[in-house]
Every structure is written in C-alpha cells, then in structure tokens.
C-alpha cells in the first residue's frame, strides 16, 4: 500500500482530535425559518478537532499531505477534519404548491476523517 | 434547495481562497524511496487556501457549518479546503515478485471545495 496505516488514538489528549460533535441549531440560526416548517430545532452532527500526523487519514492523499505539511508547513496545510459520511434527514418545508417533504442526504455528518 | 448558492469569487483577493496548487515532492520527501521506482519526483496537486463564508461550499452541510461558524466561532470550525475529486496516477514499484505497476485513485487532487 502507498501509505502507513492511519492511527486512531489521539496523541493530543481526549476530545482534541477529529471527531463528531453535536451542535444544536434553530431554524433562525440557519436562516431557514421562512421556508422550513419542521423540525424547528436540528441536532447537527459536525466534524471538529485537530488532525495530527496520520490521525484518521481519509486516504493516500491525506497521508502525503500530512507528511509534506511536516516538511513544508508554510506551503502545505495540515489535513483537516471533515465528514466521511452523512446521515439522511427529512425536512418539512413550504413550497408554492403547499407543504412538502424532502430528504437531504448531505446535511448531518455521520462520521469524520482527516482529509 | 436547503441553501444559498455557493459563491465562486474570492472575497479575500487572488489566490487566497481554496484552490488547487502544485507541490513538487521527491520520493525521499514522501518516504517512498525504498519501494517506489518511478516517477522519482511527483507533481502533487493539493488543495490550499481559506474558505470564507459560502465560498465553494461542498454541500448543504458545509453551508450550515459556515453559517454556524459565524455564530459560534469557538464551537464550530470554518469549512476547510479539501479535494473534491482526484486524478489517478500510476506508480512503478518493487514487489517480492519484481517490478509492478499500480494505479492510485486517491493520491493527486484534481479539484477542491470547502467542506
């Protein structure tokens, strides 16, 4: 394989490395109160935390990025914590033809990795 | 749709926002000199730059993240610049049975977005 194995233990201490965290947001927070009817509050899972060398590397590119960041930190950024998968969520909203249901596949993160 | 349209013009000035940049790297830089034979130097396209509000948002989640970062910057990180797609690259490397060609699909970035 083109890379060392990504590591899963956080060298920075508990809760500091890339992980999933729940953020409460109202429709007002999101600017959606004029068109979304329900839910009125969302539990949004988001990816937060740092990406130390080889921690939860998304792929070969992320491993290279981590290595080159160590060599050229001003030129190559460290990998960052982004969703690896999503949980679909249904929203009820207003449309011109009435109340409509729509499933969003890319709204709530389900897992995170360093890319 | 669940979000405003992502914008493509960088409000921070030329070259400051999320974009693709070429980084030269040798096999030694990558720690691959003991097993990769060719190429001896790689032109690695990587994603660099900032992700200001709604710039090249990857999806609905990224748009929400940008909005909540504006409201709760200590709790929600800004979106960051990561690959949206990759260019496959062929490496020639040593194996127990001789020289082998292998295509890596996730090594060189082809496009970038803010996730």
């Amino acid at each position: 394989s083109a890379h060392a194995h990504p590591r899963d233990s956080c060298p920075l201490g508990p809760g500091r490395c890339c992980h999933l965290e729940t953020v409460q947001a109202t429709l007002e927070d999101l600017g959606w109160s004029d068109w979304v009817l329900s839910p009125r509050q969302l539990q949004l899972s988001m990816c937060v935390g740092e990406c130390p060398h080889l921690y939860r590397s998304a792929n070969t590119h992320a491993q290279i990025k981590a290595r080159l960041h160590g060599l050229q930190p001003d030129k190559v950024p460290a990998p960052c914590c982004v969703p690896s998968s999503y949980t679909p969520v249904v929203l009820m909203h207003r449309t011109d033809s009435g109340v409509s249901l729509q499933t969003y596949d890319d709204l709530v993160a389900r897992g995170c990795h360093c890319a | 749709s669940a979000h405003a349209h992502p914008r493509d013009s960088c409000p921070l000035g030329p070259g400051r926002c999320c974009h693709l940049e070429t980084v030269q790297a040798t096999l030694e830089d990558l720690g691959w000199s003991d097993w990769v034979l060719s190429p001896r130097q790689l032109q690695l396209s990587m994603c660099v730059g900032e992700c200001p509000h709604l710039y090249r948002s990857a999806n609905t989640h990224a748009q929400i993240k940008a909005r909540l970062h504006g409201l709760q910057p200590d709790k929600v990180p800004a979106p960051c610049c990561v690959p949206s797609s990759y260019t496959p690259v062929v490496l020639m490397h040593r194996t127990d049975s001789g020289v082998s060609l292998q295509t890596y699909d996730d090594l060189v970035a082809r496009g970038c977005h803010c996730a």
Partner: antibody
C-alpha cells in the same frame, strides 16, 4: 412515491392478540426525523392515535392502551409492526399506518379492517 | 391529555358560501402544533393544513387556517361540492396525540 399498506388478520376472537404489519415504500425509516404511526377508527367514529416509532427507535404510546400495545420496526425491510394483546369487541376498527415525519401525519395507508367477534 | 373540541359537529353549506370550522384546545399550544385533516367517506384521511396555516400540497387556496393559543379555525372562502367531507383538528404539542371529534361538512 410514498405508499403504505396495512395487513392484518381481518377477524379474530376476544382475548386474542392482534398483529398488524405496515409495509411501506418511497421513504426510509433510517432517515433522521422519520416516523411511522398507527391510528384506528371505529366505523362511523373519530380517529384515535395508538403508537408511533421514530427512526432512532424512540417509541410513543397512547397511555390509555399502553399496557396492551407494542410497536416495532424492521427498517431494512421497510416494515413496522403493531401488536395489541387481549382484544375485545371495542377494538373493532379500521387500522391505519401513517408516515409521520417529525410532527405530522403526512401519508396514510388505505387502512385494514379488523373485526373482533366471538 | 389535551382535549380538542370541534364545532359544529355537523353543518351544511351551499356552493359559494363561506364556511368556518372551529377547534378549541383544552390548554394553550403553539400554533405550529395544530394540524387539520380531511376525510371523505370510505377513504383514508388526508393531511390538509400543517401548523395552523400551511396548506398541504394540492389543497385548494380557498382553504385557510388561523388561530393561536387555545382557539383555532379552518375556513373555506367559497364552498365547492368537492369540499364536502369530515374535517379533524389534531394537536402534536404533547403525548398522547389527540384529535377533535370531527366536523362533518355537507353540501346543501
């Protein structure tokens, strides 16, 4: 296109257990916010909510019947089940299965008539 | 539990007439938690109005809903034959979820 179809025994005797199945398509019960409810309606009468199950397996029951009701789901096969124990003639009704996203009875099945008779 | 009282229980209206059905709630609820459903004989109920005033998809614009607190209403600006049905109000403010007894609207 969302569809829900209820199936049940049609007729059963007092004291037996009523088992109802709701088979649905056009949505997933693995989607956040999605739920499925059961509501019944005796002939010529009003609507009575029985139970509700959400995507995260949160279950809600009508307290007046709670001791007799069990709702469950098989999200992978798109089915929801309701069991009512110790039925009597007052349980004779049309039973509806309803797609219930967040806080609304959005799509209703055609209903299945259940008759409890000695 | 929250009790919903509809009135009238039965009414008849002529084509073109304005119709108002009321729903009184035993304790104050948020307007976003009061819904209406329409049922025609021998068919399943249909969602009609969500959150007091938002028409379900396909509901004619002659229908409207209003209210707050403990008092809600459904209004038809101009009765048409296809509007003859039973209308139920329902609350989603607290469990158990409850319905009004229904208002049967007939064509005169």
């Amino acid at each position: 296109q969302v569809t829900l179809k209820e199936s049940g025994p049609g007729i059963l005797q007092p004291s037996q257990t009523l088992s109802l199945t709701c088979s649905f398509s056009g949505f997933s019960l693995s989607t956040s916010g999605m739920g499925v409810s059961w509501i019944r309606q005796p002939s010529g009468k009003g609507l009575e909510w029985l139970a509700l199950i959400y995507w995260d397996d949160d279950k809600r029951y009508n307290p007046s019947l709670k001791s007799r009701l069990t709702i469950s789901k098989d999200a992978s096969s798109n089915q929801v089940f309701l069991k009512i124990t110790s039925v009597d003639t007052a349980d004779t009704a049309t039973y509806y299965c309803i797609q219930s996203p967040w806080d609304w009875f959005a799509y209703w099945g055609q209903g299945t008539l259940v008759t409890v008779s000695a | 539990e929250i009790v919903l009282t509809q009135s009238p229980a039965l009414m008849a209206a002529s084509p073109g007439e304005k119709v108002t059905i009321t729903c009184s709630v035993s304790s104050s609820i948020s307007s976003s938690n009061l819904h209406w459903y329409q049922q025609k004989s021998e068919t399943s109920p249909k969602p009609w109005i969500y959150g007091t005033s938002n028409l379900a998809s396909g509901v004619p614009v002659r229908f409207s809903g209003s209210g707050s607190g403990t008092s809600y209403s459904l209004t038809i600006s101009s009765m048409e034959a296809e509007d003859a049905a039973t209308y139920y109000c329902q609350q989603w403010s607290s469990y158990p979820l409850t319905f009004g007894a229904g208002t049967k609207l007939e064509l005169k």
